[in-house]
Amino acid sequence: FNISGCSTKKLLWTYSTRSEEEFVLFCDLPEPQKSHFCHRNRLSPKQVPEHLPFMGSNDLSDVQWYQQPSNGDPLEDIRKSYPHIIQDKCTLHFLTPGVNNSGSYICRPKMIKSPYDVACCVKMILEVKPQTNASCEYSASHKQDLLLGSTGSISCPSLSCQSDAQSPAVTWYKNGKLLSVERSNRIVVDEVYDYHQGTYVCDYTQSDTVSSWTVRAVVQVRTIVGDTKLKPDILDPVEDTLEVELGKPLTISCKARFGFERVFNPVIKWYIKDSDLEWEVSVPEAKSIKSTLKDEIIERNIILEKVTQRDLRRKFVCFVQNSIGNTTQSVQLKEKRG
């Protein structure tokens, strides 16, 4: 098909040679008035943001991507020729960086429903360059972590060395959807939840005397929990004495809260102290009874078939430990009166 009628957009991807990073192209089809296809389920021309990813309708995921070879050969279907480029609905994902990704990419609807739809296409001229700016040694990573439950921020890698005052207006997308309120080079998150994770794209416009182009960077954001700085605490038993009936069976439960650790090796065990002797008791396996993002509660029971006079002289000690330290709670049995 004739691509001379396609709207054109220039993009720059400056990649870091130090890290793995991805890139995306959105199928930003032209404004609604250009064709029936583009009109469908779109906002009115006044409402359409400058770069609106092509989302939101069943039709809209049905686009075809091509690359235009530089030697003038016919257009190539992306899916057939480029294994490192993946099409996901209206988005083209580049899985590996490299100057060989430079070129012209064209997208258009698969279904041409009217003669007007032929011109409903967009040509993206992508220039890919390795980052050479040595002055910005600490530019933001393309993989950023947010600590769950705390305040955090997501920085646009291509602008992270600029102050907020110098920074141009930035257009942000999250998982392909425009974040219309965000315009600065940093998104501040007051309290981080799991839904803040995802693929973020930041765009800003650069221009010289001849032309202007969009500088784009992609940030993969993960939400993580920080390792605990606390040793485990014992929630139960609380009291250090327990009233019991002689001759009856008894179960004493030890419930301990362990803070999150990426490498999690919790220890929870019972041992008995009798005068100068102490020994570990083989008791049923520990089991997790509650799990949250920040902690896990583990229970382990000691079971006495029947309480004897000797047991009243002993101390039953629950011992819990993580990588930070340990805690103990001892229980002395006391005969119930009456």
Epitope: N175, Y193, Y195, Q197, K255, I289, K290, T292
Partner: antibody
Framework: SVEESGGRLVTPGTPLTLTCTVS????????MGWVRQAPGKGLEYIGY?????TPYYASWVNGRFTISKTSTTVDLKITSPTTEDTATYFC?????????????WGPGTLVTVSS | AAVLTQTPSPVSAAVGGTVSISCQSS????????LSWFQQKPGQPPKLLIY???TLASGVPSRFKGSGSGTQFTLTISDVQCDDAATYYC???????????FGGGTEVVVK
């Protein structure tokens, strides 16, 4: 988003698996719970599955249900349904990856157990 | 298992007025504050209003207020609107998740 599927009419004793499909977030950082509601009755807590994949059940469950998950789905298996299990079953996400602040719910799927 | 007892239904409220619903737990909830409140309208899934006993969930009007600690909790709706007509449930979470349970629900009728 969260959406349940698999609800249908089954005869007593026929195992049934309900599936909750999630999108837009990862099950590695969100706990998912199952809640049911018999026609005209209140909500009943069944259990949840933690970010690490460990299931936790309400004490009344006693092996009647099994919760498991893959990377994008959470399953609830009703091992041997009885007529008392007739209800709308909801799947819900706890953003705080706990087991009580369910802030995203599916529309529910109806299970009818009848002979 | 824990038992959560809510204010009996139905509770009547006038538009612009205030209504309070109580939720009493048979044992202390985890951290003394792991209790949430939900609103449910017929044919819809529940909607989270309050978690952590008093923290307002995202997008919930500040007319909804949760209070209480340990075993006794209250949901207060001030400046009641017609749209607040619904059934409200509390959900308690405990040291052992096997004790987790909903209250029986309280229907709020707006006049």
């Amino acid at each position: 988003s969260v959406e349940e599927s698999g609800g249908r009419l089954v005869t007593p004793g026929t195992p049934l698996t309900l599936t909750c499909t999630v999108s837009g977030f990862s099950l590695s950082s969100a706990a998912m719970g199952w809640v049911r509601q018999a026609p005209g009755k209140g909500l009943e807590y069944i259990g949840y599955i933690s970010t690490s994949g460990t299931p936790y059940y309400a004490s009344w469950v006693n092996g009647r249900f099994t919760i498991s998950k893959t990377s994008t789905t959470v399953d609830l298996k009703i091992t041997s349904p009885t007529t008392e299990d007739t209800a709308t079953y909801f799947c819900a996400r706890d953003s705080y990856a706990g087991d009580y602040a369910f802030n995203l719910w599916g529309p529910g799927t109806l299970v009818t157990v009848s002979s | 298992a824990a038992v959560l007892t809510q204010t009996p239904s139905p509770v009547s409220a006038a538009v612009g007025g205030t209504v309070s619903i109580s939720c009493q737990s048979s044992k202390s909830v985890y951290n003394n504050n792991w209790l949430s409140w939900f609103q449910q309208k017929p044919g819809q899934p529940p909607k989270l209003l309050i978690y952590g006993a008093s923290t307002l969930a995202s997008g919930v009007p500040s007319r909804f207020k949760g209070s209480g600690s340990g075993t006794q909790f209250t949901l207060t709706i001030s400046d009641v609107q017609c749209d607040d007509a619904a059934t409200y449930y509390c959900l308690g979470s405990y040291i052992s998740s096997s004790d987790n349970a909903f209250g029986g629900g309280t229907e709020v009728v707006v006049k």
